[in-house]
């Protein structure tokens, strides 16, 4: 039993780090290995995580953490029965995907502006806090050549758009995602989406 | 091996105040955030605060906001809850539980509100 | 502040059932979701963290599952010393909030 693509790990620099590899044939993840994980400093404690199937020869692995510090380092230990298989370390982080925002809603009753809005995924004292930046990806549901990103480079967490730069009469979905640049995170994933019907009124024309 | 002991609880009298210790062994209690977590008699869990070891954030539940407070002392490896105007639904056992996400627990100290 | 609502609060199973519970969560919690044990007398266990994952020396009769705002603990055969509370919590924001709770009784 061999691993084929070393385990990569991301955190949410909050409360998990994901890691995720790849061993040399079908393996049944959660009996034969067992990825173990410690904080690097004076007596720490090993966790042990138990990984899950990711595919016929994929695994992944779940790493609870207590709150993250830019300081933190881990070691990992992958292991099958008595076997070490892989040694590495991770920082959490310097391997940052945020959590996705959440609680998408898209105010309709503003003069022809549609107002969207979401939540930080991160509470006040978290560092990613005041750093996120957000894209929202509107489109279509029935043209999907209509389908455009927003930056949003503020950090309010909303974006106010002309109901009018969008098609009346038809159904919109919209998500969002963040990610941090202090960090040079990857984007986080999407939010789930929402939907609503676009409609406005036409300015009258006058001959 | 990872020991949290509860104590500090008791009877009082609605309006009155109590300070419940948690005292904590066997790892660095200063690299772990901490949490009270309470049950009624005969009802479920209820979480009730949260404190940060990384940058001392508290969080309260909404029916403790404003009379409970949260606090440590790493070097006597201590989480405290300061309970002031107590009230009748506040009588619970009360549990000290370690981060991440309550892998330890205390066995708990009583709290008895009622005249 | 994020609801969480297990189902049933009771229900009577015999040893080697298979037993689920649900809890649903009032907003998108992602897999921020953890099942713990507590028999009678005794503090509360962790069976299952981050939706999916098992705990390291829990039993593997025990399973989570779900994302979202919808989850699920499965006991594949039902032991007699699993008769106990079963909770779910979020941890996805502060408050965070347990499930009422599901006591799985011997019929």
């Known amino acids: 039993m061999k691993v084929l693509q070393r385990p990569t790990c991301v955190s949410d620099y909050m409360s998990i780090s994901t890691c995720e590899w790849k061993m040399n044939g079908p393996t049944n993840c959660s009996t034969e290995l067992r990825l173990l994980y410690q904080l690097v400093f004076l007596l720490s404690e090993a966790h042990t995580c138990i990984p899950e199937n990711n595919g016929g020869a994929g695994c992944v692995c779940h790493l609870l953490m207590d709150d993250v510090v830019s300081a933190d380092n881990y070691t990992l230990d992958l292991w099958a029965g008595q076997q070490l298989l892989w040694k590495g370390s991770f920082k959490p982080s310097e391997h940052v995907k945020p959590r996705a925002p959440g609680n998408l809603t898209v105010h309709t009753n503003v003069s022809d502006t549609l107002l969207l809005t979401w939540s930080n995924p991160y509470p006040p004292d978290n560092y990613l806090y005041n750093h996120l930046t957000y894209a929202v990806n509107i489109w279509s549901e029935n043209d999907p050549a209509d389908f455009r990103i927003y930056n949003v480079t503020y950090l309010e967490p909303s974006l106010r758009i002309a109901a009018s730069t969008l098609k009346s009469g038809i159904s919109y979905r919209a998500r969002v995602r963040a990610w941090a640049q202090c960090y040079n995170t990857t984007w986080s994933e999407w939010s789930p989406s929402t939907k609503w019907h676009n409609s406005y009124r036409e300015p009258f024309e006058q001959h | 091996q990872v020991q949290l002991v509860e104590s500090g609880g008791g009877l009082v009298q609605p309006g009155g105040s109590l300070r419940l210790s948690c005292v904590a062994s066997?790892?660095?209690?200063?690299?772990?955030?901490m949490n009270w977590v309470r049950q009624a008699p005969g009802k479920g869990l209820e979480w009730v605060s949260y404190?940060?070891?990384?940058?001392?954030?508290?969080y309260y539940a909404d029916s403790v906001k404003g009379r409970f407070t949260i606090s440590r002392d790493n070097a006597k490896n201590s989480l405290y809850l300061q309970m002031n105007s107590l009230r009748d639904e506040d009588t619970a056992v009360y549990y000290c539980?370690?981060?991440?996400?309550?892998?330890?627990w205390g066995q708990g100290t009583l709290v008895t509100v009622s005249s | 502040d994020i609801q969480m609502t297990q189902s049933p609060s009771a229900m009577s199973a015999s040893v080697g059932d298979r037993v689920t519970i649900t809890c649903r969560a009032s907003?998108?919690?992602?897999?921020?979701l953890a099942w713990f044990q507590q028999k009678p007398g005794k503090v509360p266990t962790r069976l299952i963290y981050?939706?999916?994952s098992l705990q390291s020396g829990v039993p593997s009769r025990f399973s989570g599952s779900g994302s979202g705002t919808e989850f699920t603990l499965t006991i594949s055969s039902l032991q007699p010393e699993d008769f106990a509370t079963y909770y779910c919590?979020?941890?996805?924001?502060?408050?965070?909030?347990f499930g009422q709770g599901t006591k799985v009784e011997i019929k």
């Open positions: 539980a370690r981060e991440p996400v309550f892998d330890y």
């Open positions: 066997g790892f660095t209690f200063s690299h772990s955030s």
């Open positions: 404190i940060s070891r990384a940058t001392g954030a508290v």
């Open positions: 907003q998108d919690i992602s897999n921020y």
């Open positions: 981050a939706a999916s």
């Open positions: 919590l979020q941890w996805s924001s502060y408050p965070r909030t």
